[in-house]
């Protein structure tokens, strides 16, 4: 038999595919069209090989499929005849990370494609401002991330290293808190969290504005602008105004860019519609009373950024009120 003269062997090709936890992915594999197609997708760890999906004699064969892949894999059966042996993989978990080999045999050749699957997760982080007794803290928090991210802090655009890191989740995904004590500081701070696998970066920026001194019954304008350096025009974001009182935050107003809806929780609170159209979310608080003294926090957040602006308002008694006493 002279078939071997027509037979070609193609060495193993390797591709890296990056997927997201809980999402679906396609592991690519193609071959030169031929008859008698046999496809075997296998997962290889340090000790063993596991059957992921097989196709031969014209149909999918799942008798020996490892249970962890049950109802999670399929081939593009209509495209096999066109040389497509790609595997559709549903609901990725971190345990799916690793090396997958796709063996394809036809009447004229056998090929083995190697796909390295890496799985990442990056739930949108948050920057929080907290007061504990007389201390002030900035917390950069990411609830679910994998692999371990790179977290950097800057003070007035200068990198700093002193921060307290807390991590949970021994194998991943990880939940990470990075806390910075900013008591008594008037500097601006920036925290960046980078997931190098997913090539995703999030930045939180905190700015303390100069204190505002106002008289009772007056109104105050609290500035908060969306900086174009941070936000692209079509990016969804939300704006939250809140007040910090005895370490507890209470929401005053809320704006969602996707729906353009604004909700006010304080009737004396408003913003200028013209300014809002120019991405300026400065607020007016009217008819000030002594109890309005405190810290006001503007939070503008998107998937990639959080901008926190703090205003300290001091409301002093008016002359009339003072002379009445």
């Amino acid at each position: 038999i002279f078939l071997s003269a027509f037979f070609t062997y193609v060495p193993m090709n390797e591709q890296i595919i990056i997927g997201r936890l809980g999402e679906d992915i396609i592991l690519p594999s193609s071959f030169e069209r031929g008859s008698e197609v046999v496809i075997h997708w296998k997962y290889q760890d340090s000790y063993n090989s596991y059957n992921v999906h097989s196709y031969y004699k014209g149909s999918g064969r799942l008798e020996s499929q490892d249970t962890r892949y049950a109802n999670r894999t399929s081939l593009f059966y209509n495209e096999i005849q066109n040389g497509n042996a790609s595997l559709f993989f549903r609901r990725l978990s971190l345990l799916d990370e690793g090396i997958y080999t796709c063996y394809v045999g036809t009447a004229i050749q056998a090929i083995t494609n190697k796909v390295v699957l890496k799985v990442g997760v990056f739930l949108t982080p948050m920057m929080k401002y907290e007061k504990r007794n007389t201390n002030s803290f900035l917390i950069c928090n990411v609830l679910s991330v994998y692999p371990r991210p790179i977290i950097t802090w800057k003070m007035d655009n200068t990198p700093i290293s002193e921060n307290n890191m807390q991590e949970t989740g021994s194998l991943g995904p990880f939940s990470i808190n990075s806390t910075l004590n900013i008591t008594g500081s008037n500097s601006s701070y920036e925290c960046t969290i980078e997931n190098s696998l997913l090539k995703q970066t999030w930045t939180g920026r905190w700015t303390m504005k100069d204190g505002l001194h106002k008289m009772q019954s007056e109104h105050v304008s609290l500035s908060c602008e969306l900086v174009n350096d941070y936000f692209s025009p079509n990016q969804d974001f939300k704006v939250t105004w809140s007040r910090m009182e005895s370490g507890i935050s209470s929401i005053l107003a809320y704006y969602l860019s996707s729906s353009q809806n604004t909700t006010f929780y304080e009737s004396r609170f408003s913003w200028n519609k013209e300014l809002k159209n120019q991405s300026d979310f400065s607020m007016n608080l009217t008819d000030l009373s002594l109890s309005d003294s405190g810290e006001y926090l503007c939070n503008i957040s998107s998937d990639e950024y959080t901008l926190l602006t703090i205003h300290t308002v001091h409301v002093e008694p008016s002359q009339e009120t003072a002379s009445d006493n």
Partner: antibody, heavy 121, light 106 residues
Framework: QVQLVESGGGVVQPGRSLRLSCAAS????????MHWVRQAPGKGLEWVAI????????YYADSVKGRFTISRDNSKNTLYLQMNSLRAEDTAVYYC??????????????WGQGTLVTVSS | DIQMTQSPSTLSASVGDRVTITCRAS??????LAWYQQKPGKAPKLLIY???SLESGVPSRFSGSGSGTEFTLTISSLQPDDFATYYC????????FGQGTKLEIK
Amino acid sequence: QVQLVESGGGVVQPGRSLRLSCAASGFTFSDYGMHWVRQAPGKGLEWVAIIWYDGSNKYYADSVKGRFTISRDNSKNTLYLQMNSLRAEDTAVYYCARDRSSGALGYFQHWGQGTLVTVSS
Amino acid sequence: DIQMTQSPSTLSASVGDRVTITCRASQSISSWLAWYQQKPGKAPKLLIYKASSLESGVPSRFSGSGSGTEFTLTISSLQPDDFATYYCQQYNSYSTFGQGTKLEIK
């Protein structure tokens, strides 16, 4: 071109063991399923066992199940058949044959020339 | 287990004849059937796979047909080199051979 060369045959007493080898060349051994097929003198062909390309699956004919073990060493391009508790009815020429593919198809595209095993007291 | 029955067991024919060998499966095997030719003292040689696909390098006078349980191997015009024993093999479930058909010179 594809070459399969069997060795290890000979005369053995009933109840004893024998190991057959098949040296493969001319193709990428680790890409193909391999079979053992036997033929008793003057009789027809009988399929004995198959091992898939990566050794993940092994199947046997009922007549040899529990007594014969098929294995392969892909680094040495060699197929093996360990035959234990041999019986007179195991006397045959043993062929090593290459599957068309991974072993999933189950027919024989290339054959060796065979090695004779005689079980006799 | 699937049984394969070949007929006839022996077939006498002359050079130039058209001959047909039949193979019957005890249950449906779809098209998963192969035909082999074996000469005395030699290893078998693959002729046909998937009931009707001609193996590369095999002369076109050999053809196969059938599906399910009934299959045939046809040699359209016998050549001197074709006198040998022919075996069918099902590979739907593991593997089973027919008992063989010896094609001899009349």
